[in-house]
Interface confidence: medium
Amino acid sequence: IPLTESYCGPCPKNWICYKNNCYQFFNESKNWYESQASCMSQNASLLKVYSKEDQDLLKLVKSYHWMGLVHIPTNGSWQWEDGSILSPNLLTIIEMQKGDCALYASSFKGYIENCSIPNTYICMQRTV
Amino acid sequence: IPLTESYCGPCPKNWICYKNNCYQFFNESKNWYESQASCMSQNASLLKVYSKEDQDLLKLVKSYHWMGLVHIPTNGSWQWEDGSILSPNLLTIIEMQKGDCALYASSFKGYIENCSIPNTYICMQRTV
């Protein structure tokens, strides 16, 4: 293959591969906990936004989808499933509803939503 | 790697790979001819929609982007850059402007547009 071309992955079959991360958009609506369980069952997690550069494909996503961001009421912070804190300036958090979970929306926006509301969701698997 | 996982590609560096097709969304606005030339310079073509199943990631694309579909005034048909005719039921073509080129919009819609108007564009490279 040409030097300018390369393979991406490995990813689960029929997932999107971009800059060696794997993404899948799931069409069925589930609450946050069910969405998390669905991703885990596929050896993945809900979307984690860690870089506007490495994840610039997310600019182009329409609609609203569960990601792996949750609010920790005890200290008021937002953190990812892996326990890491949301980096400043990565997402614009918009409080539309009372809630402790967040929907990803295009152009790096996060909409606060009640965790029990069904929504579509994005799973992500980081390749090594 | 697990049997359920696989590599995707090969694709140009930092392009999106999905079901062994490569896609890139270009942010700068160009007219249709300039967009076509830009894709060709990268050994690719403007987006060709050939399958709702294999290209279901296109459902989620926001905004409007040049694709490789052009109107042939002599016979009134729409065809792709490679000369193939647009298959029925793949795209809903909506005539909003007088024009011979088409913008791709989410949920498999094509908006007719004057070819000389600048718009963002999608390049695609099919892997073997």
Epitope: K62, S63, S106, S107 | S29, K59, K62, S63, Y64, T92, I93, I94, M96, Q97, L103, A105, S106, S107, K109, Y111, P118, N119
Partner: antibody, heavy 117, light 107 residues
Framework: QVQLQQWGAGLLKPSETLSLTCAVY????????WSWIRQPPGKGLEWIGE???????NYNPSLKSRVTISVDTSKNQFSLKLSSVTAADTAVYYC???????????WGQGTLVTVSS | DIQMTQSPSTLSASVGDRVTITCRAS??????LAWYQQKPGKAPKLLIY???SLESGVPSRFSGSGSGTDFTLTISSLQPDDFATYYC?????????FGQGTKVEIK
């Protein structure tokens, strides 16, 4: 010439569900998004959401958890349901055709919905 | 969401005046902008789409210009029928958003 005619209950109590329907006469139903837009008395316009003939929807995130838009292609109709209404939902509600990526045209005649206990 | 800001909120003018209304987007929207006219008790009416394209049947005294973040609606010679409220609307991305409106009233 496409025309939109809308109807539904004009007076609701808080916590009830607003329900409106819009019928499309003349012209194509497929190939367009069909929208709902509202305007509180003396205020500006707020887009609620839209649907196409296949049932594909887009919603305003500020209302998304309370809104359902559905379509009946056999009747060339689309409907809006807004649950758990409050006085803040008092507005004139319009249906409109989203003419591709550029504009809303034509519009329905509007329905004033008042929420009051 | 993309915020649309119109100015002025109210504009007093006389018949025959040249009137200019501006609309600013909170981020670039290319040319994805429409202008509407609304009269009391009526639905909005489309005037301009894609920033500068005149809707069929709309008088040529209406014109639109701009791209990116700054847009203008111009009425070259105000007529009695033009006293109304005008709204801009972006169609770059969902949720589609409108400006707060500009009321053109008789001076």
């Amino acid at each position: 010439q496409v025309q939109l005619q809308q109807w539904g209950a004009g007076l609701l109590k808080p916590s009830e569900t607003l329900s409106l329907t819009c019928a499309v006469y003349g012209g194509s139903f497929s190939g367009y998004y069909w929208s709902w837009i509202r305007q509180p008395p003396g205020k500006g316009l707020e887009w609620i959401g839209e649907i196409d003939h296949s049932g594909s929807t887009n919603y305003n995130p500020s209302l998304k958890s309370r809104v359902t838009i559905s379509v009946d292609t056999s009747k060339n109709q689309f409907s809006l349901k807004l649950s758990s209404v409050t006085a803040a939902d008092t507005a004139v509600y319009y249906c409109a055709r989203a003419r591709g990526p550029w504009s809303f045209d034509p519009w329905g005649q509007g329905t004033l919905v008042t929420v009051s206990s | 969401d993309i915020q649309m800001t119109q100015s002025p909120s109210t504009l007093s003018a006389s018949v025959g005046d040249r009137v200019t209304i501006t609309c600013r987007a909170s981020q670039s929207i290319s040319s994805w902008l429409a202008w509407y006219q609304q009269k009391p008790g009526k639905a909005p009416k489309l005037l301009i789409y894609k920033a500068s394209s005149l809707e069929s049947g709309v008088p040529s005294r209406f014109s639109g210009s701009g791209s990116g973040t700054d847009f203008t609606l111009t009425i070259s010679s105000l007529q009695p029928d033009d006293f109304a409220t005008y709204y801009c609307q972006q169609s770059k991305e969902v949720p589609w958003t409108f400006g707060q409106g500009t009321k053109v009233e008789i001076k």
